[in-house]
Amino acid sequence: SQTTFGPVFEDQPLSVLFPEESTEEQVLLACRARASPPATYRWKMNGTEMKLEPGSRHQLVGGNLVIMNPTKAQDAGVYQCLASNPVGTVVSREAILRFGFLQEFSKEERDPVKAHEGWGVMLPCNPPAHYPGLSYRWLLNEFPNFIPTDGRHFVSQTTGNLYIARTNASDLGNYSCLATSHMDFSTKSVFSKFAQLNLAAEDTRLFAPSIKARFPAETYALVGQQVTLECFAFGNPVPRIKWRKVDGSLSPQWTTAEPTLQIPSVSFEDEGTYECEAENSKGRDTVQGRIIVQAQPEWLKVISDTEADIGSNLRWGCAAAGKPRPTVRWLRNGEPLASQNRVEVLAGDLRFSKLSLEDSGMYQCVAENKHGTIYASAELAVQALAPDFRLNPVRRLIPAARGGEILIPCQPRAAPKAVVLWSKGTEILVNSSRVTVTPDGTLIIRNISRSDEGKYTCFAENFMGKANSTGILSVRDATKITLAPSSADINLGDNLTLQCHASHDPTMDLTFTWTLDDFPIDFDKPGGHYRRTNVKETIGDLTILNAQLRHGGKYTCMAQTVVDSASKEATVLVRGPPG
C-alpha cells in the first residue's frame, strides 16, 4: 500500500515585478507539492484566502495561481500558497507581486547651464516617477553619442546627475539624460529634453578638489549583494580619486582609482567606515561613510519528519541566523501555534508532552526579520502500534560460545514502547547473577553452558496488543589457539613462517586475521611479501617472503568465528647487514 505523507513543496512562488505597460496578459505564481494522497491547493492574498471561482480573473492551474490581465490597483500584494492533504497543511514562502513603471520626462524645456571653461559643472537628470530603480546615461547632441565614463566625466547611478570635473571647449553642446528601467521581462528607456551647456570665458586658475557626488553617511546592504559607493569631485587639475577602509585595508580586487567603489558580494567583514579622497596638486577633499551589513534569515537548525510514540515527549528546535536577529514562530497545518496545555512554544523550541494522535500533522517554523522570511517544514506522525517483530525478529539461530557471554536483542516495532519479558521454553526468565534483561529488552546470558541451549522467546506488550519472537540458542565450543606463533630474529631477505593453528566448533566458519603492530595485513596486495596458508581450515600460518626491515614488529594472529575469537602474539626482529 502507498505510504501516506504530508505535503512537501517542490515548487514555490517567486516575487514578480510586472511592468504596468506590459503586453503580457497573465502572471503565473508557481506552487506544487509532493504528497500522498495528492495535495489540494489554496491561495492567500495579503493574508486573506482568495475565492478562486471558475470564470474569474484568478485561476488555479494544478497548484499554480494564474492572474489574468493583472492591474496594480487590484493585484499588487503578498501571495502565499497553501498545500493540504489528510495529513496536514503547509504554507509556501510569500511572493510579492509588484508593478514596475517608468513615466516620461517632463515636456518642459530645460534651462541652459552656464559655467566658466575650466570649472566643474553638474547637469541634473531629474528623472520621472519610476519603480524600481533606474540606470542612467547621458547623450551629447545626438544619439548614440554617449558621454564616456572617464576621469573627467561621471554619471551618478544614484541620482542620474552628470558631473564634469573640469570643463573644456569640447563639452559645449546639448545634453539629454537617458533613464532605463529593468524589469522581470521588459526594459524601458526614456530621454529627457536637451539642456544646453554654455561655457563662459576660460578660467585657467587651478583649484583644489571639492567632492560633489558623495556617498551617504550610512549605506545598508544585505550579505551577498553588490554595494556601490560613489565619489566624484570638481577640481583643476582633474582630481584623482582614492578609496580606503578606515578600519582595515581594502580587498586587492577593488579598483581604488575610480569614482565608484564596488564590493561585488558584500560580507560581514566588509562592514565598516570607508573614506574617499579626491586629490590634485592644489589640495584634497575627503568624505566618509559607513557600510552596515545585514542579512536575511538563514537556517542553522531545522526540524525533520518525525515518528513519535503516543504518550512520549518530543522537543523540536529551529534556529536561524540573520541581522537583525530573526524571530521564530511556529505553524501547525498552516495556522499559528501558541502554547496550550501539552504544547509549549518557546521561540525556537517547540515542546510536546504526552503526545496524542491529534498532535499529528504538518509543522513549520518560520524565521523572519525585516529582510525576509524563511520556512522549514516537517511532518509529525504520532504512532500507536501493537508490537510487531516482522521487521526485526529475534535472531532465528543464536550461536554462543561455551563459557562466554551472549546478548540477544529484542527490538519489536511498537508504540508506545513495549514491555518485554523473556522465557526459556515455558519458564519466564528473571534477573540473576548470570541472566539479565536490560531496560531496552536485551537478554544477556553470562558464563554460558550446554544447559543454556534451547528456545528463547521475547514477549512484547503495550496497550495496543502483544507479540512474541523466538530464537534458538545453540552453545558451541569456544575457539582456541592450539599452536601459537613464536617470536623470531631473522636476517634481511629471509623467509619466515609464523604458525597459527586453532580449534573451533565445526559448525562454524573460522577466519584467521593477522596484524602487524595492530594494523591489518593485506594478503591480496600484488607483489606483497605476505602469504597465507590455505591447506586446512584450522591452519592460518603466515609466511613472510624476502623480509625487509619494515616487516619487523609485533604480529598478532586472531582466529575468529561468529561467536568468539582467540588471539596470540609474536615479535619478529629483522636484522640488516652489519654497519
Epitope: 535472531r395 558451541r476 565445526p506 559448525t507
Partner: antibody
C-alpha cells in the same frame, strides 16, 4: 572423510509422494545443521529446508505444508518427505551439511544429488 | 527476500587470462555482528556445488589462491587471476544474511 549420499529420487506423477534419504558418514547428523537445496534442470540453486541440531525445522514458502524434513539419529540419515508433488518440484535435490550464519545456517558440504522428476 | 543479481551471465575467457564476476544484493549484507554474509560457490559440469569463498573474501581450504573475493555492502566481486581448464563451470553468489538464503542466477564460465 565427510560424505553425503542422496537416494530416493525418480519419476513421480503430479500429486504423488516421495521420500528422499541422505546417508551421512564422517560426522554426526544429530549434532549438525542439515539442509536440502534443489536445482531445476538448467536452472539455478534454491534452498528448500533446514533442520537444526535441536530439531527445529524451517521451509521455503514454495514447499511449506507439502515437504517435511526429518532425521534418524540411529541411522545418521537425513530425510525429505515430499507430498502433493507438482511439475515445478522437478529438480536435482542436494542434501548439505550447514554452517552457522546470520540467516541461521548455509549449506557448505554437498552430496552428489538425486533427480526427482514430476510428470504425468 | 534478498535478491542477488549476477553479471555477466556468460563469461568466455582465454586460458591464462583473468576473469571477474560481479554480484549485487538488493540490500546490504552486513549483519549487526559486523560480518558480511556473502559467499561464492563453484559448480563444475555434472558435479555438485562447492563453496569457494566465505564472508566475502575468505578462501575455503583447498581453494587455489588464484580465486579471490572482494566487495562490501551490496557490491561484490569474484576474481580468477589466471583461468585454468578446471575452472569451467557455473559460479553462484549467495547471501546468508536473511531467511530464505538466496542465490544469484549463476555465471557460466567457459573457455574461448
Amino acid at each position: 572423510e565427510v560424505q553425503l549420499v542422496e537416494t530416493g529420487g525418480g519419476l513421480i506423477q503430479p500429486g504423488g509422494s516421495l521420500r528422499l534419504s541422505c546417508a551421512a558418514s564422517g560426522f554426526t547428523v544429530s549434532s549438525n545443521y542439515m539442509s536440502w537445496v534443489r536445482q531445476a534442470p538448467g536452472k539455478g540453486l534454491e534452498w528448500v529446508s533446514v533442520i537444526y541440531s535441536g530439531g527445529s525445522t524451517y521451509y521455503a514458502d514454495s514447499v511449506k505444508g507439502r515437504f517435511t524434513i526429518s532425521r534418524d539419529n540411529s541411522k545418521n540419515t537425513l530425510y525429505l518427505q515430499m507430498n502433493s508433488l507438482r511439475a515445478e518440484d522437478t529438480a536435482v535435490y542436494y542434501c548439505a551439511r550447514d554452517r552457522i550464519a546470520a540467516a541461521g545456517t548455509l549449506p557448505v558440504y554437498w552430496g552428489q544429488g538425486t533427480l526427482v522428476t514430476v510428470s504425468s | 527476500d534478498v535478491v542477488m543479481t549476477q553479471s555477466p551471465l556468460s563469461l568466455p575467457v582465454t586460458l591464462g587470462q583473468p576473469a571477474s564476476i560481479s554480484c549485487r544484493s538488493s540490500q546490504s549484507l552486513v549483519y549487526s555482528d559486523g560480518n558480511t554474509y556473502l559467499y561464492w560457490f563453484q559448480q563444475r559440469p555434472g558435479q555438485s556445488p562447492r563453496r569457494l569463498i566465505y564472508q566475502v573474501s575468505n578462501r575455503d581450504s583447498g581453494v587455489p589462491d588464484r580465486f579471490s573475493g572482494s566487495g562490501s555492502g551490496t557490491d561484490f566481486t569474484l576474481k580468477i587471476s589466471r583461468v585454468e581448464a578446471e575452472d569451467v563451470g557455473v559460479y553462484y553468489c549467495m547471501q546468508a544474511l536473511e531467511t530464505p538464503i538466496t542465490f544469484g542466477q549463476g555465471t557460466r564460465l567457459e573457455i574461448k
